[in-house]
């Protein structure tokens, strides 16, 4: 008799999830000499142990502690780039500006980027059919708790000037409900972080407005200032050109507004 299976509202575990995590771990540790000591089989076992056989709406940060321990990594604390709703550009930027790091440039962020996973209570099976949706089902699901945990730790590690890329095309340029707004902002350490510098990425070609004056940016400034951290804001008017000019500052097209 086929066993009854909980139907969740979100997509199921990414196909070939175990193989993908293991392969990413091997690739990452080969590319990053400082992480060569990491045993990828142990990493996978710890990852699996965080959610397998557990109810996918009852995952805690503690469940991920063994994985966090194995994935401990030191990135230069003054070279951290956070992002909200503009992941691709942030990643393209750190690929060019190699001395800056997003969460997904770290081992744990790299392992999980763009993946979905969940298990089932009391069985060792991975659920490839469906996983809980943060809004429709529950917030304490394996994926959400993972990102909350690693995002908190990443923000806590930051120092000096912390940069954040924000999407100027969205109605809420700064969204209090995003991971940045709900987790990272509140876990920057005022005794270590002097300034949060926001880079507002413009979408329209002819958009010359100063989006640093947007009400949601003023809200972010207020939150940050109350935490005794200075706030700074920059407009990136032409993100395509911006990337090109970071790659090649001598390019003749880099004389004008970016």
């Amino acid at each position: 008799v086929p066993r009854w299976r909980q139907q969740w509202s979100g997509p199921g575990t990414t196909k070939r999830f175990p193989e993908t995590v293991l392969a990413r771990c091997v690739k990452y540790t080969e590319i990053h000499p400082e992480m060569r000591h990491v045993d990828c089989q142990s990493v996978w076992d710890a990852f699996k142990g965080a959610f397998i056989s557990k109810h996918p709406c009852n995952i805690t940060e503690e469940d991920y502690q063994p994985l966090m321990k194995l994935g401990t990594q030191t990135v230069p604390c003054n070279k951290i780039l956070l992002w909200s709703r503009i992941k691709d550009l942030a990643h393209q930027f750190t690929q060019v500006q190699r001395d800056m790091f997003t969460l997904e440039d770290t081992l744990l962020g790299y392992l999980a980027d763009d993946l979905t996973w969940c298990g089932e209570f009391n069985t060792s099976k991975i659920n490839y059919q469906s996983c809980p949706d943060w809004r429709k089902d529950c917030s304490n699901n394996p994926v959400s708790v993972f990102w909350k945990t690693v995002s908190r730790r990443f923000a806590e590690a930051a120092c000096d000037v912390v940069h954040v890329m924000l999407n100027g095309s969205r109605s809420k340029i700064f969204d209090k409900n995003s991971t940045f707004g709900s987790v990272e902002v509140h876990n920057l350490q005022p005794e270590k972080v002097q300034t949060l510098e926001a880079w507002v990425i413009h979408g329209g070609r002819e958009d010359s407005r100063d989006l640093c004056q947007d009400p949601t940016i003023k809200e972010l400034e207020s939150i940050i200032s109350k935490r005794n951290i200075q706030f700074s804001c920059k407009n990136i008017y032409r993100p395509d050109k911006f990337l090109q000019c970071v790659k090649n500052p001598e390019d003749s097209s880099c004389t004008s507004e970016i």
């Epitope: 003054n78 070279k79 500006q97 001395d99 800056m100 000096d160 000037v161 940069h163 010359s208 100063d210 640093c212 700074s232 804001c233 920059k234 407009n235 990136i236 008017y237 911006f242 000019c245 970071v246 500052p249 001598e250 880099c254 004389t255 004008s256 507004e257 970016i258």
Partner: nanobody
């Protein structure tokens, strides 16, 4: 933190030259325009010159055009203002500032800048 520190001010005779420097230390990425402003006693700061992020585009106020030259070195994290043919009316406190954007679109407006140095005094005697 990003610090802007001016140096090079002083007392000179009319017709002399002076070179101001602005160190913008603490920056991982030097991708923003910078500018020089000056302030006369009891007056608002006024725009003097600006340079885009890569150093390839500049802008000057009419009062200094042809006499002052702005430049920058992103590797050394320095910006400069070479001041020639100085006049007594150039006497002021000179401030360097970092702009909110990479280009010179808002370079003449104080609101276009969000980081400021503390200033260096330039006095030109007749």
């Amino acid at each position: 933190d990003v610090q802007l520190q001016e140096s090079g001010g002083g007392l000179v005779q009319a017709g002399d030259s002076l070179r101001l420097s602005c160190e913008f230390s603490g920056r991982t990425f030097s991708g923003f325009a910078m500018g020089w402003f000056r302030q006369f006693p009891g007056k608002e700061r006024e725009f003097v010159a600006a340079i885009n992020w890569s150093g390839s585009d500049t802008d000057y106020s009419d009062s200094v055009k042809g006499r002052f030259t702005i430049s920058r070195d992103n590797v050394k994290q320095m910006m400069y203002l070479a001041m020639n043919s100085l006049k007594p009316e150039d006497t002021a406190v000179y401030f360097c500032a970092e702009a909110r954007s990479a280009g010179l679109g808002s370079s003449r407006r104080i609101e276009g800048y969000d980081k400021w140095g503390r200033g260096t005094q330039v006095t030109v005697s007749s």
